[in-house]
Amino acid sequence: LTCLGGFASPGPVPPSTALRELIEELVNITQNQKAPLCNGSMVWSINLTAGMYCAALESLINVSGCSAIEKTQRMLSGFCPHKVSAGQFSSLHVRDTKIEVAQFVKDLLLHLKKLFREGQFN
């Protein structure tokens, strides 16, 4: 990142507030799901590792016209310190693997709950 002319730095591990709010929103989406989420749109699967918030946003931002995940997209942008736009491809995506948005949200939710339990808020 230093080649960009500035530098990105991780902050201290923040309180659990932000992560809890994101988890609550994902729970809300999964529980209120009536028809297929986002009309069954497919998104790139991601590696749930370091940098996953940016990767998740890069994946979900390619879904347009789906109000159910707009708040999630906005919340993820508050975790990711760089500018994300539709059409980007992250090295954290699992190449050639696409899954439905509903499955993506479930996978992300399970992982975030695990992080929350372990106290890894960053």
Partner: antibody
Framework: QVQLQQSGDDLVKPGASVKLSCKAS????????INWIKQRPGQGLEWIGH????????YDNEMFKDKAKLTVDTSSNTAYIHLSSLSSEDSAVYFC?????????????WGQGTSVTVSS | DVLMTQTPLSLPVSLGDQASISCRSS???????????LEWYLQRPGQSPKLLIY???NRFSGVPDRFSGSGSGTDFTLKISRVEAEDLGVYYC?????????FGGGTKLEIK
């Protein structure tokens, strides 16, 4: 309505440090970046850096890397800038501004600014 | 760092006139994601800056349609079709594509 309320003006001695605050209200604090901008008297604007409140990660202007440290307290919806080893060059108005994902990260709301005067 | 050069430094106008401010970047300001993060802000005397235009040509909510932004690559322009008294102040262009993000030096719009 969206508001960014900044702490009061400060008079500090050379070599001292100061911590300025920016309290957000009227929106979900952790969903929007907070940028910090410096404006010296009668001068233009300089971008110091921004912080993603959800993760606490920052992007900083290298010119300020030994001068400014950006942090947030998500429990009180407050962003902070800690300025250290102050000199007359640091006398300026410091603004916080929200970076909005909805408007392609543009700074859509600004605080009123905090004036810092460095003088012995 | 990307240098943003605004011209003119000062722009005296009569109310009702058209005004045009130019902003030139020292290098292309297309972000690696393909977007051009070029914004325009107005700072009225004694106030905080306010967002007018984002992503080159998009007007922010509540900004009158007499304001328009255009340009690409390294050359950008802000036009005000009919200047009103509330438009007076200093206009800044800003690039948010390459870190460190940078502002232009400002253009002061004043009454002739």
């Amino acid at each position: 309505q969206v508001q960014l309320q900044q702490s009061g003006d400060d008079l500090v001695k050379p070599g001292a440090s100061v911590k300025l605050s920016c309290k957000a209200s009227g929106y979900t604090f952790t969903s929007y970046w907070i940028n910090w901008i410096k404006q010296r008297p009668g001068q233009g604007l300089e971008w110091i850096g921004h912080i993603a409140p959800g993760s606490g990660e920052t992007y900083d202007n290298e010119m300020f890397k030994d001068k400014a440290k950006l942090t947030v307290d998500t429990s009180s919806n407050t962003a902070y800038i800690h300025l250290s080893s102050l000199s007359s060059e640091d006398s300026a108005v410091y603004f916080c501004a929200r970076g909005s994902f909805t408007f392609f990260y543009a700074m859509d709301y600004w605080g009123q600014g905090t004036s810092v005067t460095v003088s012995s | 760092d990307v240098l943003m050069t605004q011209t003119p430094l000062s722009l005296p106008v009569s109310l009702g006139d058209q005004a045009s401010i130019s902003c030139r970047s020292s290098q292309n300001i297309v972000h690696s994601n393909g977007k051009t993060y070029l914004e325009w802000y107005l700072q009225r005397p004694g106030q905080s800056p306010k967002l007018l235009i984002y992503k080159v040509s998009n007007r922010f909510s509540g900004v009158p349609d007499r304001f328009s932004g255009s340009g690409s690559g390294t050359d950008f322009t802000l036009k005000i079709s009919r200047v009103e008294a509330e438009d007076l102040g200093v206009y800044y262009c800003f690039q948010g594509s390459h870190v460190p993000y940078t502002f232009g030096g400002g253009t002061k719009l004043e009454i002739k």
